[in-house]
């Protein structure tokens, strides 16, 4: 099933201590899906979308950007025929970068 879209949403982090907010959204015909956010291939957070919505927004508290490294991806799962769970393709990656400090 098709991959979700992924985007960084404000407030954008300005340092590694700031929270990171990431929105993931499934295509139109998959409301209420279960979403998984990955970083560097490891599960960061799991959320279920409201039954009438196609997406969720993840809040990663400050400091969670330190480890593991690598880009963020998300994926969603839905119950298909015979109540079998079907997983989407992984989203495109999202990289979180911080402004270079000016001294």
């Amino acid at each position: 099933i098709p991959a979700p879209s992924i985007r960084l949403v404000p407030p954008y982090p300005s340092s590694q201590e700031d929270p990171i907010h990431i929105a993931c959204m499934a295509p139109g015909n998959f409301p209420g899906a279960n979403f998984t956010l990955y970083r560097g291939g490891q599960v960061v957070q799991l959320l279920q979308a409201p039954t009438d919505q196609r997406g969720v927004t993840f809040n990663l508290s400050g400091g969670s950007s330190k480890a593991p490294g690598g880009p963020f991806h998300c994926q969603y799962g839905v119950l298909g025929e015979l109540n079998q769970s079907q997983l989407s393709d992984l989203s495109e990656p999202v990289n979180v970068s911080f402004p270079v400090p000016t001294w």
Partner: antibody, heavy 120, light 110 residues
Amino acid sequence: QVQLVESGGGVVQPGRSLRLSCAASGFTFSSYAMHWVRQAPGKGLEWVAVISYDGSNKYYADSVKGRFTISRDNSKNTLYLQMNSLRAEDTAVYYCARSSGSSWSNIAYWGQGTLVTVSS
Amino acid sequence: QSVLTQPPSVSGAPGQRVTISCIGSSSNIGAGYDVHWYRQLPGTAPKLLIYDNTNRPSGVPDRFSASKSGISASLAITGLQAEDEADYYCQSYDSNLSGVFGGGTQLTVL
């Protein structure tokens, strides 16, 4: 299904305190950001406060900052609003509401509200 | 005084199209925060109508649509029906991370 049930409203004198509670069920409470929104009689919606899924971040409207405290007990699936130094202008229906995710985003689910009346 | 500005009332005849504007500033809508729309019937809790600027929850008719540009957003309702009479609110966030609502717009179907 998602259920949010507010309690603790009532009549209170100016300057006194009140604590509202919101019992949540039908979802994994500890995964979602939660809000309080209020509505004065005959007026519009006013956002009051939000707390992150783990309680680590809290933000308030300027009108209640320093007087109201939002908190949560994830082991009890309960959201709280401690209201101190109440004023007549705090009179409103207070709604407990759930965000669509662990971040603020949209308010996907609302309780039915509890009425707080501040009057001498 | 609400942070987001909406017209207090709009009206239209059945079948017509109406729009409700929501004007913010560079610290909220203009800063990239998403805009959400809620509908409230008298004596009931608000209900989500549009989320993340343009998306309809399932069950909301496609007569309802929304857009966002710069510091403002708007909600459009086509094919107006008597049951559309309600109060409509836009909502976003501010750069201090507090939520902000519009003052609400009362829609009257003539």
